[in-house]
Interface confidence: medium
């Protein structure tokens, strides 16, 4: 019987609406035993991996991805995926990061994230392409 890996979750601290130049931290959570968390960006070739995984609770692990100074180019959709040997998980809901011009604290609470997706091992055509997990040898173009 194969283990059903729970979908990861994604959130942003301090929120999803960030003033230009401020910091934001994406938090990816999954079950205990995760080896690698990946934060994916709104481009199939843009992602960042970390093995710096901490235990958030007895049943949950997490990884944090910090952007120290948010730029307009950081706006967009993000989601998480994780590797718990020997499998990659499904992908988390979407989280949309909005970057605003004016300074000051975020004017929006964490929004409810949305969709989910699974990694494509062998993409079928470019219009529907999702990149393969890192174990497939695809080069990461880092997010920041």
């Amino acid at each position: 019987q194969e283990e059903d890996l729970p979908r990861p979750s994604i959130s942003a601290e301090p929120g999803t609406v960030i003033p230009l130049g401020s910091h934001v931290t994406f938090v990816c959570r999954g079950p205990v035993g995760v080896q690698t968390f990946r934060l994916e960006r709104d481009s199939r070739s843009t992602y960042n991996d970390t093995e710096d995984v901490s235990q958030a609770s007895p049943s949950e692990s997490e990884a944090r991805f910090r952007i120290d100074s948010v730029r307009e180019g950081n706006a967009g959709l993000y989601r998480c995926i994780y590797y718990k040997p020997p499998k990659w998980s499904e992908q988390s809901d979407y989280l949309e990061l909005l970057v605003k011009e004016s300074s000051g604290g975020p004017d929006s609470p964490d929004t409810e994230p949305g969709s989910s997706a699974g990694p494509t091992q062998r993409p079928s055509d470019n219009s529907h392409n999702e990149h393969a997990p890192a174990s497939q040898g695809l080069k990461a173009e880092h997010l920041y």
Epitope: E2, R44, G114, A117, Q121
Partner: antibody, heavy 120, light 110 residues
Framework: SVKESGGDLVKPEGSLTLTCKAS?????????MCWVRQAPGKGLEWIAC????????TYYASWVNGRFTISKTPSTTVTLQMTSLTVADTATYFC??????????????WGPGTLVTISS | ELVLTQTPASVEAAVGGTVTINCQAS??????LAWYQQKPGQRPKLLIY???TLASGVSSRFKGSGSGTEYTLTISGVQCDDAATYYC????????????FGGGTEVEIK
């Protein structure tokens, strides 16, 4: 392509299993396969989806209430087991492939549908 | 709970004219919206995804637009073959399959 089978005339409170056979693509490509139904003269209603990758996540509409079960086999087949059927379950049942990427989640391949009629 | 409201429920169009169908989401769906065409007695067909990207083989007479919570499907140079019901579908909360589709818009050609 995808093709459904198993539609039939069933009495209320009866059970039925629908089968969806996929061809031309592999489940190892980690899609979702979904069932969507359409009652006569009505709109589209999503029932359930299953992830075809190495984990088998299943997702159901809240109204299903455990009456329907979606499952897959390694040989590119997805089934929908339906129990405690009522007249309101009369519909054409479509099998579809769902792509999920940064273009969103959308149904790019549909079967022709199979008709399920619940009547005494 | 994310809900899609599609308007109008039905519309009549003249050959060569233009049809506009609206789809409103109860929260922002980040352009992750698809449109489908379903002709009577047939399976649905994907027309547009990510709000404005035409699916393979779809005529450029179909145009999707919008952002945030408001989206529009425009059919220009309407042809008799366009008689169908059109559905929007949000692809933002993809594994919460409740209320994924709009209620549909029937397009009749006069």
């Amino acid at each position: 392509s995808v093709k459904e089978s198993g539609g039939d005339l069933v009495k209320p409170e009866g059970s039925l299993t629908l089968t969806c056979k996929a061809s031309g693509f592999s489940f190892s490509n980690s899609y979702y396969m979904c069932w969507v139904r359409q009652a006569p003269g009505k709109g589209l209603e999503w029932i359930a989806c299953i992830y075809t990758g190495s984990t088998s996540g299943t997702y159901y509409a809240s109204w299903v209430n455990g009456r329907f079960t979606i499952s897959k086999t390694p040989s590119t087949t997805v089934t929908l087991q339906m129990t405690s059927l009522t007249v309101a379950d009369t519909a054409t049942y479509f099998c579809s492939r769902k792509l999920t990427n940064f273009n969103g989640a959308y149904l790019d391949l549909w079967g022709p549908g199979t008709l399920v009629t619940i009547s005494s | 709970e994310l809900v899609l409201t599609q308007t109008p429920a039905s519309v009549e169009a003249a050959v060569g004219g233009t049809v506009t169908i609206n789809c409103q989401a109860s929260q922002s769906i980040s352009n992750l919206l698809a449109w489908y065409q379903q002709k009577p007695g047939q399976r649905p067909k994907l027309l547009i995804y990510r709000a404005s990207t035409l699916a393979s083989g779809v005529s450029s007479r179909f145009k999707g637009s919008g952002s945030g919570t408001e989206y529009t499907l425009t059919i220009s140079g309407v042809q008799c073959d366009d008689a169908a019901t059109y559905y929007c579908q949000q692809g933002y909360t993809s594994n919460n399959v409740d209320n994924a589709f709009g209620g549909g818009t029937e397009v009749e050609i006069k």
